[in-house]
């Protein structure tokens, strides 16, 4: 899995008038990391693990970046001609990634009232627009605004790409938290399914990094993909992740089944409780 930094900013308008302030969240490696506190006008870490990433450093740089980005997005919303009465939102999601081979990706996505209408591969400058006519109209509107000051926006987006990657590298280099290995806690449970069958569920929790293999085996052989149900690998709020896998088996055959887990080069097997 690549390391990633994801900015999610939203600005609002009411009856065509852009509202002051903005909403902002930042995710690091898929985990809630920062949010913008509108009362205090500051970027604040989301939980202890986020504080641990930067140690005792202040969040001034993050506050400055988010404030600048919020201002830019408000200006963009002001130039959308489509705004009718009522409440409307413009959301910008920016993601940069560093992959294992050190290659990078950087993308930007705009949503109006929750609908994606414009994306850009920031590195190559390729724009993509969904097929719908509304998306096409909105995209043309926003791109024309961005082109009005082409040199500024060109500099802005390249700086944005560089800044995102620079911040991500800074977090990765300064943080023991992001280089750590936390093995999962694995727990197997069973529940009655239907006559003669039981559902067995294998849960892995509190692990880092995110990459994990979790699968059911029968007599030491992995079950086929379509006989298992997998949960998403989700952040648990503590800077670690959780997931699960379940399958249905015949009652009385429990001893033939084990849950196999592989994480960060370590693996283990876990029997079904009797």
């Amino acid at each position: 899995e690549p390391h990633s930094l994801r900015y999610n900013l939203t600005v609002l308008s009411w009856d065509g008038s852009v509202q002051s302030g903005f909403l902002a969240e930042v995710h690091l490696d898929g985990q809630p990391f920062l949010r913008y506190d509108r009362q205090k006008c500051r970027a604040k870490p989301q939980g202890q693990w986020a504080e641990d990433v930067l140690g005792n450093k202040t969040w001034d740089r993050e506050t400055r970046d988010l404030t600048g980005n919020g201002k830019d997005l408000r200006m963009t919303l002001a130039h959308i001609k489509d705004q009718k009465e009522g409440l409307h939102s413009l959301q910008e999601i920016r993601v940069c990634e560093i992959h294992e081979d050190n290659s990078t990706r950087s993308s930007q996505h705009f949503y109006y009232d929750g609908e994606l209408f414009l994306s850009q591969n920031v590195e190559t400058e390729e724009w993509t627009v969904p097929q719908s006519s509304r998306a096409q109209t909105l995209a043309m509107n926003v791109r024309n605004f961005l082109k009005e000051d082409a040199m500024k926006t060109k500099t802005h987006y390249h700086a944005m790409h560089a800044d995102c990657l620079q911040e991500l590298r800074r977090y990765l280099e300064s943080s023991v938290v992001l280089r750590r290995r936390v093995p999962p806690m694995v727990n197997v449970t069973r529940s009655e399914a239907s006559e003669g069958n039981i559902t067995v569920t294998c849960r892995a929790s509190s692990f880092y990094p995110r990459n994990i293999t979790l699968t059911w085996r029968q007599d030491g052989v992995s079950l086929s993909h379509d006989t298992q149900q997998w949960g998403d690998v989700l952040p648990d709020g503590n800077g670690t992740y959780q997931t699960w896998v379940a399958t249905r088996i015949c009652q009385g055959e429990e001893q033939r089944f084990t849950c196999y887990m592989e994480h960060s080069g370590n693996h283990s097997t876990h029997p079904v409780p009797s």
Epitope: T104, N121, T124, E126, A150, T153, K154
Partner: antibody, heavy 115, light 108 residues
Framework: QVQLQESGPGLVKPSETLSLTCTVS?????????WNWIRQPPGKGLEWMGF???????KYNPSLKSRVTISRDTSKNQFSLKLSSVTAADTAVYYC????????WGQGTTVTVSS | EIVLTQSPATLSLSPGERATLSCSAT???????FHWYQQKPGQAPRLLIY???NLASGIPARFSGSGSGTDYTLTISSLEPEDVAVYYC?????????FGQGTKLEIK
């Protein structure tokens, strides 16, 4: 209809600079897209050399970066390639192409590097 | 850089047969930045399929594309003699843009 046409000398001496121009008709190079140079040595595959984007940004293949320059002349709706210090290994068919998924191509021009 | 490896290098099939060409990447590619090209002898390449699965203008429906992540496939459902060509995959996710080495399709 969008058309691209490469032009330039077909023979270049070793150590000299190869210069090619792509003339675009039917679309403004400042409207959108990347405007690319791609080459193909005889009997070999395709190699992307670089592009100039609609905004004027240039990107190059790191394998050629120190030798390649791509520029544009917006008044003529043209973009150009310069490749310095050429050797026989630069003998190829040179194509200009539009986009990121290259949807329009020139017909290609053969450049031979030989003394 | 992202290296694309195409297989097989050469494919020899009879008219009417189904052709499957593969392209494997060393790093994950966004499917909207993955494309296929056809190059016939003495001609410039032409865009065949863009963004993994969309047919370019004028391309017959017997051509289709699929894939995600690091593995992509071009399928020709029923080969025609005019499909003799070299087929290239290409990624536009990161700079430098790269092509596969090509698969040569021959008709028996």
């Amino acid at each position: 209809q969008v058309q691209l046409q490469e032009s330039g000398p077909g023979l270049v001496k070793p150590s000299e600079t190869l210069s090619l121009t792509c003339t675009v008709s039917g679309y403004s190079i400042t409207s959108d897209y990347a405007w690319n140079w791609i080459r193909q040595p005889p009997g070999k595959g395709l190699e992307w050399m670089g592009f100039v984007s609609y905004s004027g940004t240039t990107k190059y293949n790191p394998s050629l970066k120190s030798r390649v320059t791509i520029s544009r002349d917006t008044s003529k709706n043209q973009f150009s390639l310069k490749l310095s210090s050429v050797t026989a290994a630069d003998t190829a068919v040179y194509y200009c192409a539009r986009g990121y998924g290259f949807d329009y191509w020139g017909q290609g021009t053969t450049v031979t590097v030989s003394s | 850089e992202i290296v694309l490896t195409q297989s097989p290098a050469t494919l020899s099939l009879s008219p009417g047969e189904r052709a499957t060409l593969s392209c494997s990447a060393t790093s994950s590619i966004s499917s909207i930045y993955f494309h296929w090209y056809q190059q016939k002898p003495g001609q410039a390449p032409r865009l065949l399929i863009y963004r993994t699965s969309n047919l370019a203008s004028g391309i017959p429906a017997r051509f289709s594309g699929s894939g995600s992540g690091t593995d992509y496939t071009l399928t020709i459902s029923s080969l025609e003699p005019e499909d003799v060509a070299v087929y290239y995959c290409q990624q536009g996710t990161t700079i430098p843009f790269t092509f596969g080495q090509g698969t040569k399709l021959e008709i028996k």
